[in-house]
């Protein structure tokens, strides 16, 4: 069975979060997708979204967030460049399907951004620093203003467990699995 998981990414200021959310392409290929932050006890806040209908592999940039929807592969790529400590938080991808509720995609991302020279990688970071060159053709999409009361999400309690490898999966009652992922540039 599909498990709702939360993956933890620990990065330094200035680095790039580069993740993907997969979806059933037959159902959602051209649907509008969004990247949201979930703050404790609050409704998810949409930070960026693709165009409507979503265009295939056409980058959309909103500030430091770049979304790229690969229709033919059923993947939404999300990049958050030049990370700041205040970007730390819990994120998720959703698919807008009005008038129905937004459809949440797996996995949620727990982002932890710490101070430090991004050019001096830590022990389990890659030594290559990716500097993304954003194509000049990126566009900014307008995101739907509606937020359904049923999309209020209770953020999972913060676990004190520190899982050192992705295979050390822990199951906590009523809490999503938290997997610590090696730091990516």
């Amino acid at each position: 069975a599909t498990k709702l998981t939360e993956e933890k990414y620990e990065l330094k200021e200035g680095q790039t979060l580069d993740v993907k959310c997969d979806y059933t392409l037959e159902k959602f290929a051209s649907s509008q997708k969004a990247w949201q932050i979930i703050r404790d006890g609050e409704m998810p806040k949409t930070l960026a979204c693709t165009e409507r209908p979503s265009k295939n592999s056409h980058p959309v940039q909103v500030g430091r967030i770049i979304l790229e929807d690969y229709h033919d592969h059923g993947l939404l790529r999300v990049r958050m460049v030049n990370l700041q400590v205040e970007d730390s938080g819990l994120y998720q991808c959703v698919i807008y399907q009005p008038p129905k509720e937004p459809h949440m995609l797996f996995d949620r991302i727990r982002l932890v951004v710490t101070k430090g020279f991004s050019g001096t990688p830590g022990s389990n970071e890659n030594s290559t620093q990716n500097v993304y060159k954003i194509p000049p053709t990126t566009t900014k999409a307008l995101c739907p203003l509606y937020t359904s009361p049923r999309t209020v999400t209770q953020a999972p309690p913060k676990s004190t467990a520190d899982v050192s490898t992705p295979d050390s999966e822990i199951n906590l009652t009523n809490v999503t699995d938290i997997i610590r992922v090696p730091v990516f540039n």
């Epitope: 599909t2 993907k20 959310c21 997969d22 392409l25 797996f106 996995d107």
Partner: antibody, heavy 122, light 107 residues
Framework: QVQLVQSGAEVKKPGASVKVSCKAS????????INWVRQATGQGLEWMGW????????GQTQKFRGRVTMTRDTSISTAYMELSSLRSEDTAVYYC???????????????WGRGTLVTVSS | DIQMTQSPSSLSASVGDRVTITCQAS??????LNWYQQKPGKAPKLLIY???NLETGVPSRFSGSGSGTDFTFTISSLQPEDIATYYC?????????FGGGTKVEIK
């Protein structure tokens, strides 16, 4: 032991289908993507597509769309790749390969099966 | 699709020689480049990921460098067991694409 074990060689007639299996062991199957890569005799590597074993979602390159089906059975940590409407040019070794974490844009393959030779001949 | 052009397609060198293979992408791939080694009759093996990071257990005689569209793979001192075909692979954009391969032989 961390490994991917693939099913044995197959000989098929043009127009038929083939289903190759890839059994994972030694790691959490649902945490990493499974990719399929093929290699015709004496040729280079060609990526076919990916499978997220957790969600079951898949994606294929344009070339294989409509002909390839990627599935999984999480209870036995096994991924499958079925290719239909076979033609002689599909004769190749088919590899399954472990990709990055399911949520990461990390498309490198650090674990490979030994490959399954599929021969299409009338 | 991003085209990956590898050169040379084959080379012959002596044991102990420094061997260099180049890989050129048809557009900037933001350092999303990996290198694999494939020995005859075997599955490929990841050697280097993200341009220059050595996979665990891979000998330090293998290295990678480059940025933008031009990348280089080097074997500092060729060993008999390095006889293989080497492939580069980009993952900046889908579909993932591989170079055509470079076959390395011993003189």
């Amino acid at each position: 032991q961390v490994q991917l074990v693939q099913s044995g060689a197959e000989v098929k007639k043009p127009g038929a289908s083939v289903k190759v299996s890839c059994k994972a062991s030694g790691y959490t199957f649902t945490r990493y993507d499974i990719n399929w890569v093929r290699q015709a005799t004496g040729q280079g590597l060609e990526w076919m597509g990916w499978l997220n074993p957790n969600s079951g979602n898949t994606g294929q390159t344009q070339k294989f769309r409509g002909r390839v089906t990627m599935t999984r059975d999480t209870s036995i940590s096994t991924a499958y790749m079925e290719l239909s409407s076979l033609r002689s040019e599909d004769t190749a070794v088919y590899y399954c390969a472990r990709g990055g974490y399911t949520s990461a844009w990390r498309w490198y393959f650090d674990l490979w099966g030994r490959g399954t030779l599929v021969t299409v001949s009338s | 699709d991003i085209q990956m052009t590898q050169s040379p397609s084959s080379l012959s060198a002596s044991v102990g020689d420094r061997v260099t293979i180049t890989c050129q992408a048809s557009q900037d791939i933001n350092n999303h480049l990996n290198w694999y080694q494939q020995k005859p009759g075997k599955a490929p093996k990841l050697l280097i990921y993200d341009v220059s990071n050595l996979e665990t257990g891979v000998p330090s005689r293998f290295s990678g460098s480059g940025s933008g569209t031009d990348f280089t793979f080097t074997i500092s001192s060729l060993q008999p067991e390095d006889i293989a075909t080497y492939y580069c692979q980009q993952y900046d954009k889908l579909p993932l694409t591989f170079g055509g391969g470079t076959k390395v032989e011993i003189k």
